[in-house]
Interface confidence: low
């Protein structure tokens, strides 16, 4: 009976609306992988951040952000046992807790950051189990009782490995988009020079060329200072 | 009203097991966790660890992992800690408490131990 | 682990007194602690909880103050009934564990 309950209360929250919250459940001592998609192209050069609410309609209290900048986003930043990465391509973000503890447990947001603004992506319930006497299945995910508030909370079973020491991950598809823009940008000021030279015509005056850097169509990759006349 | 009712004092030589049971009432007992604690005589408080009444999830202090056991029997709402291989320095009288909820959350009035039982005293003597 | 330590170990004070119990954490708790009562021959009492929460039905005289490493329980007005031995709790870290506690006596 209560596989069937989790069942009907997981298929009530899909077709619910769009902040309601997703409890992701977690042993003690080990890390846990939180994870807040969101729509790539509406949040495009948008930094995130992971923020923790301070009782029920006080604050988010900022946790961790993505990097400064956007381009950057997949480098995984640490504030002490919190990791946060962001697969802008994907539209995945992806926050990690270290060493689970009972203090790691309450409520959270993945926010989506514009100016002084944030949107938030996803509203988060962190819990912290105890050790796991035995390997269960899914009909022993806990869903919300009597005594609990979210009714319509989404329940995510995320309980992951301990991530090792300088362990770095597979790099997404935005670190690989990078480096493919910055081999054109590199191929394109080499091209330049080379016509330049070519034609005895002075580098500034070479017309500027569009750069795409192979996403859809409509959306440039923004040129950042760093990057700018390579 | 919330209660935990113990099992009663028991004596035990060295190398024996005891087993110390606590009643819960007055609440859904799958909600909640049950934690253990003892004290010894004239001494402080020592956590023990605690067991979720929902799943049967357990975590131990570690200078007991290995000898202690703890569970419950939802049909009856009833927590059990069993320890064993006995030593004169686990004479003391030990706690039953209600709490932390199934899963820790929020701030830190998930994990308060609250109510207690009236403990049960266990003596280690050769 | 997180050593809880509770300063003084023995308060003498008279009925009608007020009582400042301490209660210091080896690294931060936040304000993940609790502070319970315990009268000779009775289970622990919570009285406090998330370092200033008053439990259900505990009288107004009680107080918790602090967060990060330093706490304080304090009784306004000493009643003949709050005379006891006080214990503070970390429910911070694992494993989750308890000062050595503070006796109030009658002066």
């Known amino acids: 009976m209560e596989p069937l309950r989790l069942l009907i209360l997981l298929f009530v929250t899909e077709l619910s609306g769009a902040h309601n919250t997703t409890v992701f459940q977690g042993v003690a001592g080990q890390s846990l992988q939180v994870s807040c998609p969101y729509d790539s192209m509406k949040h495009w050069g948008r930094r995130k951040a992971w923020c923790r609410q301070l009782g029920e309609k006080g604050p988010c209290q900022r946790v961790v952000s993505t990097h400064n900048l956007w381009l950057l986003s997949f480098l995984r930043r640490w504030n002490g046992s919190t990791a946060i990465t962001d697969d802008t391509l994907g539209g995945t973000l992806t926050i990690t807790l270290r060493n689970l503890q009972p203090h790691d447990a309450g409520l959270y947001q993945c926010q989506s950051l514009h100016g002084s603004e944030a949107d938030t992506l996803r509203k988060v319930l962190v819990e912290v189990l105890a050790d796991p006497l035995d390997h269960r299945d899914a009909g022993d995910l806990w869903f919300p009782g009597e005594s609990e508030s979210f009714e319509d909370a989404h329940v995510e079973h995320s309980i992951s490995r301990s991530l090792l020491e300088g362990e770095i991950p597979f790099p997404p598809t935005s670190i690989l988009l990078l480096l493919a823009c910055i081999f054109l940008i590199k191929i394109l000021a080499a091209s330049a020079l080379w016509a330049a030279a070519w034609h005895g015509q002075k580098p500034g005056t070479h017309p500027p060329s569009e750069l795409d850097c192979g996403h859809d169509p409509g959306y440039q990759l923004q040129t950042l200072p760093g990057l700018r006349d390579t | 009203q919330v209660q935990l009712v113990q099992s009663g004092a028991e004596v035990k030589k060295p190398g024996a097991s005891v087993k110390v049971s606590c009643k819960a009432s007055?609440?859904?007992?799958?909600?909640?966790?049950i934690s253990w604690v003892r004290q010894a005589p004239g001494q402080g408080l020592e956590w023990m660890g605690w067991?979720?009444?929902?799943?049967?999830?357990?975590n131990y202090a570690q200078k007991l992992q290995g000898r202690v056991t703890m569970t419950t029997d939802t049909s009856t709402s009833t927590a059990y800690m069993e320890l064993r291989s006995l030593r004169s320095d686990d004479t003391a009288v030990y706690y039953c408490?209600?709490?932390?909820?199934?899963?820790?959350?929020?701030?830190?009035?998930?994990?308060?131990?609250?109510?207690w039982g009236q403990g049960t005293l266990v003596t280690v003597s050769s | 682990e997180i050593v809880l330590t509770q300063s003084p170990a023995t308060l003498s004070l008279s009925p009608g007194e007020r009582a400042t119990l301490s209660c210091r954490a080896s690294?931060?708790?936040?304000?993940?602690l609790a502070w319970y009562q315990q009268k000779p021959g009775q289970a622990p009492r919570l009285l406090i909880y998330?370092?200033?929460k008053r439990a259900t039905g505990i009288p107004a005289r009680f107080s918790g103050s602090g967060s990060g490493t330093d706490f304080t329980l304090t009784i306004s007005s000493l009643e003949p009934e709050d005379f006891a031995v006080y214990y503070c709790q970390q429910v911070s870290l694992f494993p989750l564990t308890f000062g050595g506690g503070t006796k109030v006596e009658i002066k």
């Open positions: 690294q931060s708790v936040s304000s993940y």
């Open positions: 067991i979720s009444a929902y799943n049967g999830n357990t």
């Open positions: 007055g609440y859904t007992f799958t909600n909640y966790g």
């Open positions: 998330d370092a200033s």
């Open positions: 408490a209600r709490g932390p909820t199934k899963a820790y959350y929020g701030s830190g009035s998930y994990v308060v131990f609250d109510p």
